[in-house]
């Protein structure tokens, strides 16, 4: 899966209700000023915001870990997208690390799917065609995180 992390240390948005629902928000790529009067741009390549908001700060851009490659760089409206390096994958159960893909299938099995950044190789029994469910399950469903949902800690 791709990793898009939010910084849990960010200061929460102001909680007070504003007089009008149509005012007091800033567009994606911005945050609100301390006095709630103006909108301030996020810093390109440093932080971002994806939605209309009244955050006092933009969210810090994720830095890809070693073992990951940057698929999309951070903009003021979109976080960095990190992906596991070739030969490694991230599984649903442990999205915080990239695990090495298996190099081959057990005896009596044949590979039907190559390693991808989001799934290990997939092996099936030669005769029956049933999937191998060894210690590393095949992950077929791509899981992405919606903005605003912490996926893994920021590095």
């Amino acid at each position: 899966i791709t990793r898009q992390s939010l910084d849990p240390q960010r200061r929460a948005a102001p909680q007070q209700k504003r007089s009008s629902p149509t005012e007091g928000l800033c567009p994606p790529g911005h945050h609100i000023s301390e006095d709630s009067r103006e909108c301030i741009s996020c810093k390109y390549g440093q932080d971002y915001s994806t939605h209309w908001n009244d955050f006092l700060f933009c969210l810090r851009c994720t830095k890809c870990d070693s073992g990951e490659v940057e698929v999309n760089s951070c903009t003021t409206t979109r976080n960095t997208v990190c992906q596991c390096e070739e030969g490694t994958f991230r599984e649903e159960d442990s999205p915080e690390i990239c695990r090495k893909c298996r190099t081959g299938c057990p005896r009596g099995m044949v590979k039907v799917k190559d390693c991808t950044p989001w799934s290990d190789i997939e092996c099936v029994h030669k005769e029956s065609g049933t999937k191998h469910t060894g210690e590393v399950p095949a992950v077929e469903k791509t899981v992405t995180t919606s903005p605003g949902t912490p996926a893994s800690p920021c590095s």
Epitope: T22, P27, Y44
Partner: antibody, heavy 119, light 107 residues
């Protein structure tokens, strides 16, 4: 093709009000923020405010808060700016412009509406 | 409000010359600067944003640079159609503000 079509020139008397329009076409109306910018004859540009049809968000430059009122009609993809208590200082060309929901620069502009305030 | 100062109201140049138009912000605007070209009787046209990113369809003779408070629009080989008015704009903090404009004239 993205187009912002503005209403025609206006000649109005001091103290009156006027409503300028800007009709958007060629893109999804609710996905972009629309702005109004003032340009007095032979002078620079001044940002008046924005209207975002996606959530009806409005923001004014404090300088124009008591002068301009921004509204929109989603059914006709049109934004409006009403200017009240007009004086000769309001005589200018008024542009509408749009920007994506990101950095505040303007990628498309209307042709401008000339407003003349004179008795 | 942030004041954007274009110190030269007019600049003289010749076709084929390299020319640089400058803009100074009253505070750090973190490269959130756009440049527009405006021809007589027309609306402004976006050239550059984020100080150095060229807008779609803008000829590569136009380049933007700068950081902090100082920004520059450079036209590396001026064409006859470039002899017009240029504005800088900060898109860092509302109210977004423009410079007073610089008019490129023939020498």
């Amino acid at each position: 093709k993205v187009q912002l079509q503005q209403s025609g020139a206006e000649l109005v008397k001091p103290g009156a009000s006027v409503k300028l329009s800007c009709k958007a076409s060629g893109y999804t109306f609710t996905e972009y923020i629309l702005h109004w910018v003032k340009q007095k004859s032979g002078q620079g540009l001044e940002w008046i405010g924005w209207f975002y049809p996606g959530n009806n968000n409005i923001k004014y430059n404090e300088k124009f808060k008591d002068k301009a009122t921004l509204t929109a009609d989603k059914s006709s993809s049109t934004v409006y700016m009403e200017l009240s208590r007009l004086t000769s200082e309001d005589s200018a060309v008024y542009f509408c412009a749009r920007h994506e929901q990101g950095p505040g620069y303007f990628d498309y502009w209307g042709q401008g509406t000339t407003l003349t305030v004179s008795s | 409000d942030i004041v954007m100062t274009q110190s030269h109201k007019f600049m003289s140049t010749s076709v084929g010359d390299r020319v640089s138009i400058t803009c100074k912000a009253s505070q750090d605007v973190n490269t959130a600067v756009a440049w527009y070209q405006q021809k007589p009787g027309q609306s402004p046209k976006l050239l550059i944003y984020w100080a150095s990113t060229r807008h779609t369809g803008v000829p590569d003779r136009f380049t933007g640079s700068g950081s902090g408070t100082d920004y520059t629009l450079t036209i590396k080989s001026v064409q006859a159609e470039d002899l017009t008015l240029y504005y800088c704009q900060q898109h860092y903090i509302t109210p977004w503000t423009f410079g007073g404009g610089t008019k490129l004239e023939i020498k």
